[in-house]
């Protein structure tokens, strides 16, 4: 369960891959597409509003919380649209939705080496947002082996003067 309904904090950031490709969002035919691309020098990076929530570890939902909390995040590149996991299609999509957000919009945040982060599906533990063929996809990761896999590592470049209503 998500602890409370409001985020503990929010920040505005641009998102890039471990290899410094930018994650960009484009409105095409009334729906948003997500791209992973090398940005031209002067092109501005797309911003994403990250909202951080606390959640109990699944194992302690009925207990006293000693297993601690997980930090969960939702990612919104434009007003009323959120990144969501489509576990059936192994895809990452942008959907318009109202609060309360569906579980598919929540990702467990993992801090990694080199100040990178990974995003694990709340709805499908062991499945992470990753890069596949210049697109974002859902990638199954063996916990004990490949948590450092470069294709699930992302860099957040925070824009410090953030506003809650963006775009």
């Amino acid at each position: 369960s998500i602890t409370g309904i409001s985020p503990i904090t929010e920040s505005l950031a641009s998102l890039s891959t471990y290899n410094d490709q930018s994650i960009t969002f484009a409105l095409e035919d009334e729906s948003y597409e997500i791209y992973v691309e090398d940005l031209k020098k002067d092109k501005k990076k797309d911003k994403v509003l990250l909202s951080y929530y606390e959640s109990q570890h699944p194992s302690s939902e009925s207990g006293d919380g000693v297993d601690g909390k997980m930090l969960m995040v939702t990612l919104s590149p434009t007003k009323d649209f959120w990144l969501q996991a489509n576990n059936k299609e192994h895809s990452v999509e942008l959907h318009k939705c109202e609060k309360p957000l569906p579980d598919q919009a929540f990702f467990v945040l993992h801090n990694r080496s080199f100040n990178c982060v990974s995003f694990e599906c709340k709805t499908d533990p062991g499945v992470f947002i990753g890069v596949k063929d210049n697109h974002l996809a859902l990638i199954k990761v063996d916990y004990s082996e490949n948590l450092g896999s470069e294709n699930i590592l992302f860099k957040l470049s925070e824009i410090l003067e953030h506003h809650h209503h963006h775009h």
Epitope: M70, L109, Y143, S144, E158
Partner: antibody, heavy 122, light 107 residues
Framework: QVQLVQSGAEVKKPGASVKVSCKAS????????MYWMRQAPGQGLEWMGW????????NYAQKFQDRVTMTRDTSISTAYMELSRLRSDDTAVYYC???????????????WGQGTLVTVSS | DIQMTQSPSSVSASVGDRVTITCRAS??????LAWYQQKPGKAPNLLIY???SLQSGVPSRFSGSGSGTDFTLTISSLQPEDFTTYYC?????????FGGGTKVEIK
């Protein structure tokens, strides 16, 4: 309840190594990164690195990179921090700590061991 | 590395006083700042996380605020057990770094 119990005080000669243990109980050991800090007498706190008990992956502060090794034994829920080539300025209390969040350091350190005093003296 | 500058390094106050400790980061850390209290011979104790969230079990006289580079810890009404040392810590990027500490002493 969550407990981190560290090994006892050590006195070492310069050039020697020390290995401090941190036994975790009251939670799923593999579900939380373990961090190590130290505090020299009368000084502030210094972060040394972390280990992911699940994978064994580590990340060390550059200052300690060539002298520190963090390991774990999941069968006994214990993390270890070994510091080699000890110098007199390594004299400090060494702490293990568990973060508020399982795999993120953003929330700070919620649970701490009681500390292990390591004295380096000839 | 992100440097954390805490001020003042010490402050003298009386029971019931309001005390404010500030912490400045050398670069922006959004809201990922923690505050700790440390009593002599003991491990630090987490008071505040995410700049303004009160850790469970910590008295409500402790509060935190700020974002970006400037943060404050406020003790609204000092109690006898509050006379000790406080540290801030940036929890944003590696290497994780602490402020130099603020000792709250009895006037």
């Amino acid at each position: 309840q969550v407990q981190l119990v560290q090994s006892g005080a050590e006195v070492k000669k310069p050039g020697a190594s020390v290995k401090v243990s941190c036994k975790a109980s009251g939670y799923t050991f593999t579900g939380h990164y373990m961090y190590w800090m130290r505090q020299a007498p009368g000084q502030g706190l210094e972060w040394m690195g972390w280990i992911n008990p699940n994978s064994g992956g580590t990340n060390y502060a550059q200052k300690f990179q060539d002298r520190v090794t963090m390991t774990r034994d999941t069968s006994i829920s214990t993390a270890y921090m070994e510091l080699s080539r000890l110098r007199s300025d390594d004299t400090a209390v060494y702490y293990c700590a568990r973060g508020r969040y399982g795999s993120s350091w953003y929330g700070g350190f919620e649970y701490w061991g009681q500390g292990t005093l390591v004295t380096v003296s000839s | 590395d992100i440097q954390m500058t805490q001020s003042p390094s010490s402050v003298s106050a009386s029971v019931g006083d309001r005390v404010t400790i500030t912490c400045r980061a050398s670069q922006g850390i959004t809201s990922w700042l923690a505050w700790y209290q440390q009593k002599p011979g003991k491990a630090p104790n987490l008071l505040i996380y995410a700049a303004a969230s009160l850790q469970s079990g910590v008295p409500s006289r402790f509060s935190g605020s700020g974002s970006g580079t400037d943060f404050t810890l406020t003790i609204s009404s000092l109690q006898p057990e509050d006379f000790t040392t406080y540290y801030c810590q940036q929890a944003y990027s590696l290497p994780l770094t602490f402020g130099g500490g603020t000792k709250v002493e009895i006037k």
